[in-house]
């Protein structure tokens, strides 16, 4: 999906008002310095591409993020403010439902959500030069 046509300011508002809080809740009990940020993004469409991938694509050691509250709110925000997004994700969602077995918070998931927090922060500051 091409995120170029999304309403970025509305997605930013959704992140600041709800998604960020859900990410913090998920990460509660871990230190902010515990994980190094290894995933980065260069502009807002790129950030959303990476956020989408990390949030909804199962990875080795973490296959259970899609049903978390922050993930559901992310999906809704993308559907609401990215024209055509929801329909492109229907098949992916069905595949995800089949893949998901149980909701277990692993260290790998915590690391992945830490990466997500970094991507969202970068999305909110698009004019900052890449480090």
């Amino acid at each position: 999906y091409d995120f170029t046509n999304c309403d970025f300011e509305k997605i930013k508002a959704a992140y600041l008002s709800t998604i960020s809080k859900d990410l913090i809740t998920y990460m509660s009990g871990t230190k902010s310095t515990e994980f190094n940020n290894t995933v980065s993004c260069s502009n807002r469409p790129h950030c959303l591409t990476e956020i989408q991938s990390l949030t909804f694509n199962p990875t080795a050691g973490c296959a259970s993020l899609a049903k978390e509250m922050f993930a559901m709110k992310t999906k809704a925000a993308l559907a609401i403010w990215c024209p055509g997004y929801s329909e492109t994700q229907i098949n992916a969602t069905q595949a995800m439902k089949k893949a998901r077995k149980s909701k277990v918070t692993t260290n790998k998931c915590l690391e992945q959500v830490s990466q997500l927090q970094g991507l969202w922060r970068r999305f909110n500051r698009p004019l900052l030069k890449q480090q």
Epitope: T18, M72, I80, P83, G84, E87
Partner: antibody, heavy 121, light 112 residues
């Protein structure tokens, strides 16, 4: 400029057929769900039908189900509403609108000028 | 079907004064993903409707900030902080939580 222009309205006898068209311009038509809304003379707004951007999902009001067919041609940036077995209660101004999919929560953010359909003998 | 009920039916307002329109749904419009699928439209005399507010409180592009939306669950309000002559027309609420999408009956706003 984002624009929706309807055509095809007119006077038709009960039981007759009519095909409404909507030409879209100024935006990437294939990215958006589209919806038909109607308004009977002096009355409020009534949702008629919606179609998602790739035609995967189509919805109809019970009052038109089995009689009306919504379709779109993304290559031509056009939306259509085929209306069969028309009744007097279908008399209304029909609006072509952008939205009705998930985008903006299904709100209708662009409206055409409307086209009048009169069903009378 | 979700029934949308608007009050009042009509409203006569002095320019510069505030106005408030209520919309009530027969069931909650809160989606499980955390957004509420309630929108407001204005139909000015002789014109097509236009989107004012979507998802309860988000102003549509180009809508003046004197318009604001609020509410949750089944009770919603559209407020105009200072009514201007150009605000006359019929205001409609709409739910898009589930099909059939349904509109309120409308509230006619006139200037005194």
């Amino acid at each position: 400029e984002v624009q929706l222009v309807e055509s095809g309205g007119g006077l038709v006898q009960p039981g007759g057929s009519l095909r409404l068209s909507c030409a879209a311009s100024g935006f990437t038509f294939s990215n958006y769900g589209m919806t038909w809304v109607r308004q009977a003379p002096g009355k409020g707004l009534e949702w008629v039908s919606s179609i998602t951007f790739a035609s995967s999902y189509i919805y109809y009001a019970d009052s038109v189900k089995g009689r009306f067919t919504i379709s779109r041609d993304n290559a031509k940036n056009s939306l259509s509403l085929q209306m069969n077995s028309l009744r007097a209660e279908d008399t209304a101004v029909y609006y072509c609108t952008r939205g009705g999919g998930a985008y903006y929560g299904g709100s209708l953010d662009v409206w055409g000028q409307g086209v009048l359909v009169t069903v009378s003998s | 079907d979700i029934v949308m009920t608007q009050t009042p039916l009509s409203l006569s307002v002095t320019p510069g004064e505030p106005a408030s329109i209520s919309c009530r749904s027969s069931q909650s419009l809160l989606h499980s993903y955390g957004y509420t699928y309630l929108h407001w439209y204005l139909q000015k005399p002789g014109q097509s409707p236009q989107l004012l507010i979507y998802l309860v409180s988000y102003r549509a592009s180009g809508v003046p900030d004197r318009f604001s939306g609020s509410g949750s669950d089944t009770d919603f309000t559209l407020k105009i902080s200072r009514v201007e002559a150009e605000d006359v027309g019929v205001y409609y609420c709409e739910q898009t939580l589930q099909t059939p999408y349904t509109f309120g009956g409308g509230t006619k706003v006139e200037i005194k």
